[in-house]
């Protein structure tokens, strides 16, 4: 058997620096939550911890404070390099600046793939636009590789501004041709990684053949199994188990939002690739995890501009 | 096990070239970036290239830019270093190292071959 | 180029000694240092990585600690295997550089 740790985000919109509970500004440092600097050092300390770790976002990072007002992107793709996160699906917010905001702040400057498979750019775009976001990546883990496939709400068009240009797929029919490219190429992992909500988490976990982990966002959802740590109410247990249509056992997982917790699910893998076991929780990103010290000084250090453009 | 052995060393005059194989073993090589570290005798450690698991990028040391390629054979289990318009301070002991398997970003060197030595000399 | 400065270069120690090296890099390199010892006509050997973790197989008198621009390397209890060459190494970006080497000699 092989394990797996899936260190997941989602819906951060722009939460770089710490919040209250409520996710609203900080005013009480010693009660606040979340924020770049202690998500780093808890997901340093589990990957110290675990030998096999993915950190992996699932879409809207862009909207939220004055953060993305004034930096538009580029603070995403400089504290996710920071981070050194793994993989993001495109969520729909971030395309609140047109194509060319996500094109220039992040998709050229993210070290890590970004991904959506039913996204499909048409046009004079499709060149400009080729190979900076894919629609699936293959992870090498250890000695290990996990598939990582992407998608993002097709209701993105209504909901933000991504142009003439993009055509938003059906989701599952957009996974299902890729996954099966997935499974030719030999990679008996895959974790579908996107933006379109929970409902559509779990239809993508019953209809996919060969995903065998969702992790989602766009709704926000909690899951929590035993006693939430905070006021935030679950809507299920972590991780929520779907059975697919093939009869497998599928694990589903978001992790609420606005960095306020960090999402971990420990996947056991057979030699076939099968899932065995699934299990963890979200991880509430409370003051008792102190904040790295040196991606606070870099969160100081832009956040001099802001207190500018605040006066 | 794990293992890393360099070949292709030897003496050589300024100007020549040389080539530097690692033959991996014991794990999945074409999961793994790989670098070339070098040993000048009595000296300390200088990182020289780097080339990612799935070969998409490489990156080299300003002092071999333009001279030194890096290159893999996953199908082989082998790294390379070719040395081109070798110089007298290339003179050093090549080791080749795997990285910790940080993806797409740099890393630290969790497994080190026994070094192969070159020596450019007149 | 990251700058990584190695202090002290060479240091005398008796076994059972706690022996502290430093290595301070000349911009902030969050947690991404590795240390690595290495023996005469031997490759060096991975110590620590991530600032603070322990490679397996490693024995547990070795530690690290430090965030952003200054790390240090500990040896809780010198011991006759330990007198060696330590180099720090930062993997924060391109090009990977190294500490200049602490000789650790036995008194």
């Known amino acids: 058997a092989w394990e797996l740790t899936i260190l997941h985000t989602n819906d951060v919109h722009s939460r770089l620096e710490q919040t209250s509970e409520d996710s609203s500004k900080c005013v009480n440092a010693s009660r606040c939550m979340g924020g770049v600097a202690r998500l780093f050092t808890k997901v340093q300390q589990i990957r110290r911890a675990e030998p096999n770790v993915l950190l992996l976002d699932a879409g809207d990072q862009y909207q939220g404070t004055i953060w993305f007002t004034v930096y538009k992107g580029a603070e995403v793709a400089h504290f996710m390099n920071a981070l050194r996160y793994d993989a993001m699906a495109l969520g729909n917010h971030e395309f609140d600046n047109g194509v060319e905001g996500l094109i220039e702040p992040l998709l050229k400057e993210a070290k890590f793939p970004i991904l959506s498979a039913n996204i499909k750019a048409k046009g004079p775009l499709a060149s400009q636009i080729s190979g900076l976001y894919l629609p699936y990546k293959v992870l090498p883990v250890g000695d290990e590789v996990v598939g990582i496939v992407g998608y993002t709400s097709k209701e993105t068009p209504f909901l933000s501004n991504p142009g003439t240009n993009l055509v938003f797929e059906d989701e599952i029919t957009a996974l299902q041709p890729e996954v099966d490219k997935l499974k030719t190429l030999n990679v008996n992992k895959i974790i579908a990684l996107g933006h379109s909500g929970f409902e559509m988490d779990k239809l993508i976990a019953q209809k996919v053949r060969g995903v065998d982990v969702v992790v989602g966002g766009h709704s926000n959802t909690f899951l929590y199994t035993g006693n939430p740590p905070s006021k935030e109410v679950p809507a299920g247990k972590y991780p929520f188990i779907v059975t697919s249509d093939d009869g497998r056992k599928v694990p589903v997982v978001q992790a609420y939002a606005f960095g306020k917790y960090l999402g971990y699910l420990k996947i056991e893998f057979d030699e076939r690739g099968n899932v065995i076991s699934s299990h963890g929780n979200p991880i509430l990103l409370n003051s008792s995890i102190p904040e790295d010290p040196s991606i606070k000084a870099d969160i100081n250090k832009w956040r001099i501009k802001l207190d500018n453009y605040s006066t | 096990q794990v293992q890393l052995v360099e070949s292709g060393g030897g003496v050589v005059q300024p100007g020549r070239s040389l080539r530097l194989s690692c033959a991996a073993s014991g794990f999945t090589f074409s999961n793994y970036g790989m670098h070339w570290v070098r040993q000048a005798p009595g000296k300390g450690l200088e990182w020289v290239a780097v080339i990612w698991y799935d070969e998409s990028n490489k990156y080299y040391a300003d002092s071999v830019k333009g001279r030194f390629t890096i290159s893999r054979d996953n199908s082989k289990n082998t790294l390379f270093l070719q040395m081109n318009s070798l110089r007298a301070e290339d003179t050093a002991v090549y080791y080749c190292a795997r990285g910790y398997n940080s993806r797409w970003y740099p890393d630290a060197f969790d497994i080190w071959g026994q070094g192969t030595m070159v020596t450019v000399s007149s | 180029d990251i700058q990584m400065t190695q202090s002290p270069s060479s240091l005398s120690a008796s076994v059972g000694d706690r022996v502290t090296i430093t290595c301070r890099a000349s911009?902030?390199?969050?947690?991404?240092l590795a240390w690595y010892q290495q023996k005469p006509e031997k490759a060096p050997k991975s110590l620590i990585y991530a600032a603070s973790s322990l490679q397996s197989g490693v024995p547990s008198r070795f530690s690290g600690s430090g965030s952003g621009t200054d790390f240090t390397l500990t040896i809780s209890s010198l011991q006759p295997e330990d007198f060696a060459t330590y180099y720090c190494q930062q993997y924060n970006s391109y090009p990977l550089t190294f500490g200049g080497g602490t000789k650790v000699e036995i008194k």
């Open positions: 911009q902030g390199i969050s947690s991404w």
